[in-house]
Structures are given as C-alpha cells and as structure tokens.
Amino acid sequence: MDSFNYTTPDYGHYDDKDTLDLNTPVDKTSNTLRVPDILALVIFAVVFLVGVLGNALVVWVTAFEAKRTINAIWFLNLAVADFLSCLALPILFTSIVQHHHWPFGGAACSILPSLILLNMYASILLLATISADRFLLVFKPIWCQNFRGAGLAWIACAVAWGLALLLTIPSFLYRVVREEYFPPKVLCGVDYSHDKRRERAVAIVRLVLGFLWPLLTLTICYTFILLRTWSRRATRSTKTLKVVVAVVASFFIFWLPYQVTGIMMSFLEPSSPTFLLLKKLDSLCVSFAYINCCINPIIYVVAGQGFQGRLRKSLPSLLRNVLTEESVVRESKSFTRSTVDTMAQKTQAV
C-alpha cells in the first residue's frame, strides 16, 4: 500500500477556500423548503384549524345525542378518530419546517405519525360499519327493528377501533429515529433494514385492507342501496345516505396518492431516482390524506345548508339536524308487525 500515490486528492469541484458551514446541506440544496413541503405545510395548517374546531363541534353535537340516536354514534366515532389525528399536526408541521428534523424523541416518532394510519383504519372500518347499517336498514328493516340498538352500535365501534389499533401495530413497531451524521439531523421514519419482504407485506396489507377491499365492498354496497332507493321512488329524506356517500368518496379520493406512492416505494430500490422523488412527495401525500380529518365537518355543513335551503340555523343546530337524524326504524320496539311492514317501504329511502 505504501506505493499508493497519496497526494492531496482531486475531488472534482473541491475548493480549499470553502469553509464548512454546518447549516449548508451537503447536496447543496438551499435552506429553503421544497415546493411539496410548502404545500404540505399549508394543507396541515388548514386541516388543523378546520379539523380541530370542526370535529370538536361535531363531537359536542353528537355526544349528547349518542344515547338515543344511532347515527350520532357513527358520526361521533368518526369525529373522534379525526380529532385525535389532528392533535399530531403541530408536531408534524414543526418537523417539516425544520427540514424533517425530529427533535421529539423515539416515543413521539412511534406514536404521532402512526395516528394518521390509526385514523385511516378506524375511519374505513367505521365507514364499513355505517355502510352495513345503511344496507341493513334498506334490505332488512324488520331485523333492524328488532336488533338495531345503541348497544350494538357501540360494540361495532369498539370492534372497529380494536381492529384499527391492531392493523396500525406494524407501522408503529418499525418506526425509528435515525441521527444522521451530516448534515446533523435526527430523522423519524420506518426502517425495515434487512427485511424488504416485510416492508412490502405491510404496504400490500395497508393497500388491500385500507383501500382496495373497502373500495370494492363499499362500491357494491352503495350501488345496491342507491339502486333500491331510486327504484322505490324514495318518499323521505335521503340526507344521511348522501352524507355517508360523500364521506366514503372523500376517504378514497384523499387516501389515493398516499397508497399509490406507498406501494411504489416498497417495491423500489431506496437509492433509485424514482424512490427519491417519491420520498420528496411523501409529506405532501401525507398532508393530502390528512384532509380526511377535516373534510367530514365541511361535508356536514354543506349538506346541512343544502337541506336547509340556506344557512338559517346556527352551526350546532345545523349539524345536529344532519348528524342525529333518526332512522325510520326506531329503537323503540313497541311497533306492531303491520306498522313495521308499512314502514319497510319507506325505509328503502334511508
């Protein structure tokens, strides 16, 4: 080795006059944030303001009605899922502002970014439960008259939350903080290291259980419901149905970019140009998915205005009107069989 020519090496664009500034990124990108990150910050800010206030209002309106109205139970649980996710936003916002530096520690890294996935699974499972409820109301009104009660609704919600927690565990477990040497930065992310297969498995499970399977089943479910509703020439308000369809549609629209980039990244080589491009878009995709956490209150208000003709009532009473509409099949089981039969015709419109 002594024969190796150890002269001062030529590093190409090496300039001995440069002084090493700790704040200068090594890839010579400036300290200004990238456009996708700026867009993500704007979305996060709007989602936080609308999401916290809107969902808090929804929780307040539905909490009082949840004892007697099943629809209120559904919307209450959806709002709680969204509200919880919004609480992580100030931390995620701060991290992006600091060029994805994560000074909040390992526990926060595992929990906070996982909240949006918990929200995804909780939301889709709750939406599936709500959709099953709408389906039964239309196709099994007598069963609903006998068994559809607040207790069963709460049990269904508890099962949805439990499954959501279970499905979030893999992402939670693989989240780690990594302290990069230069530029000095602590990053929060998932690290599967030796296990590319497991990374793909998690991404596929997330895509299938959190997106494709619900998309297929809910599309079929609402196709049947809407066909029945239209064929029966609905005689009463389809308010709740329209709201639920809007909520379900928004779920799939806003989760699409996250799911597509997620599955692509799991199959790409981490040092490939496409992977690095998708990684730069990651914050934007997450922020786009986060719109789900504030869109529901907006849908409720828009729906309320539509149903009221114009905004005549106060916001709480408008929301109450949309979210706590009692289904035709009441929780009281004192109706006669003939009453239920005559009601069955009208129930198709729910």
Epitope: D16, T19, D27, K28, R178, Y181, F182, Y192
Partner: antibody
Framework: QVQLQQSRAALAKPGASVKLSCKAS????????MHWVKQRPGQGLEWIGY????????RYNQNFKDRATLTTDKASSTAFIHLNGLTYEDFAVYYC??????????????????WGQGTILTVSS | DVVMTQSPLSLPVSLGDHASISCRSS???????????LHWYLQKPGQSPKLLIY???NRFSGVPDRFSGSGSGTDFTLKISRVEAEDLGVYFC?????????FGSGTKLEVK
C-alpha cells in the same frame, strides 16, 4: 503534502487525565473537521467524535461524552483530545483523522482521507 | 448504534487470486439524500488506516483499479481482482450515514 503529526506515545496513571495533540500541515486547518478514533490493541476502531476548528463545534460518541474533550488551537493548527478519569480500558492507540471538504453528493465530510500516525496511550500505575 | 459485521474475519489468499470481503450493517445506510456512506480502509501492521473506497464504490486518489466496491442499504462488498503483496493487511468497513460513526471488526487478508 497533507500531514497530521501526532506525538508517538503518552503515559498516564489510572484516574489521571491526559492531553494528546495532532498538528496539521499542508492544508488550511480551519477548513476541515478533525475526528478522533480509538483502537485498542488487536481490536477494531472506535469513533470518539469530531471538532470543527473554525467555530469549535463538536459532536461526541455517547460512549466518550463525559470523558473526552476535543479542542483546537488555530494559531498552531493543532487539534487536542483531553481524556480524563483514565482506566486500563483507555490503553489504546488514538488517531486523529481529517475529513475532506467539498459540496457534492459523494463528498462532504463523510470519510477520513488522511490519518495521523497515532499516539499510543499507556495507562499504568 | 449501527453494528457493522464483516466476514470473513480472516481471508487466506494466494497472490494473484481474487478476494472478496463482505460487510453488513444492522440498519440501512441509505442517507436521506440517497447516498450510502459506506467506506473501506486498509490498515497494515504498525501503520494507521488508509482510505481505499469511499461512498460504496468510489476509489480514493492513488488506489489501484483492482479494488472495487459495491452494495446498497445493508449489504456491501469489497473486491480485489488480483491480490498483490502490498494489499495484505486488515480491511475495515466504516459507515458515516448515522451517528455514532462505526467500523467493522476487520478482515485480515493474508497469504496462504
């Protein structure tokens, strides 16, 4: 010609402290971070930390945080490592090593392009 | 800390032979900028380590082209196409993606 000149040997008693030096020549001292690496006899290499001579900014391996202090003297282009509370575990060769300075994807201060010849620290009562 | 595992620990070769040393990290070494900051050093008896390869596959100034490096993520390899007498010594891999910087335990290249 880049050179990092270290004193050949140092001797200290357990519990005492020692200051090892590394004199740089052949380049602008303040333009390059200086790292320190420990190698126990017949063992692998262990990173201690680095110092940026231009502003005194330093960063340590947690294993050495309480017992190693890195300093520089710009006037004499010399880097120092001060080790306190010495134990027999500190008996090792201590290297200073320079990192290159360049703003490019593969470059930056990521690898040690020049090393000192090492100082053997003997801890003996 | 990132643990760097080298294999084999000892590699007996005949001069002119090919040699291959493997280095595996306990965590991915892919930096947020896409680079793998994995380097190879050679230390001869009584000398300080000398840089051979930096950032996986870049030969340092004055290093012969018989040395080549490859790999990404957690698995890396140093290859010597035709071993010469001056190549004998202990080879260390090192990562500088994450803090603390860490080194492999070394692979001793020796004559059979």
């Amino acid at each position: 010609q880049v050179q990092l000149q270290q004193s050949r040997a140092a001797l200290a008693k357990p519990g005492a402290s020692v200051k090892l030096s590394c004199k740089a020549s052949g380049y602008t001292f303040t333009n390059h971070w200086m790292h320190w690496v420990k190698q126990r006899p017949g063992q692998g290499l262990e990173w201690i930390g680095y110092i940026n001579p231009i502003n005194g900014f330093n960063r340590y391996n947690q294993n050495f945080k309480d017992r190693a202090t890195l300093t520089t003297d710009k006037a004499s282009s010399t880097a120092f490592i001060h080790l306190n509370g010495l134990t027999y575990e500190d008996f090792a060769v201590y290297y200073c090593a320079r990192v290159p300075l360049s703003y490019g994807g593969s470059y930056g201060p990521y690898f040690f392009d020049f090393w000192g010849q090492g100082t053997i620290l003997t801890v003996s009562s | 800390d990132v643990v760097m595992t080298q294999s084999p620990l000892s590699l007996p070769v005949s001069l002119g032979d090919h040699a291959s040393i493997s280095c595996r990290s306990s965590q991915s070494l892919i930096h947020s900028n896409g680079n793998n900051y994995l380097h190879w050093y050679l230390q001869k008896p009584g000398q300080s380590p000398k840089l051979l390869i930096y950032t996986v596959s870049n030969r340092f100034s004055g290093v012969p082209d018989r040395f080549s490096g490859s790999g990404s993520g957690t698995d890396f390899t140093l290859k010597i196409s035709r071993v010469e007498a001056e190549d004998l010594g202990v080879y260390f891999c090192s990562q500088s993606t994450l803090v603390p910087l860490t080194f492999g335990s070394g692979t001793k290249l020796e004559v059979k």
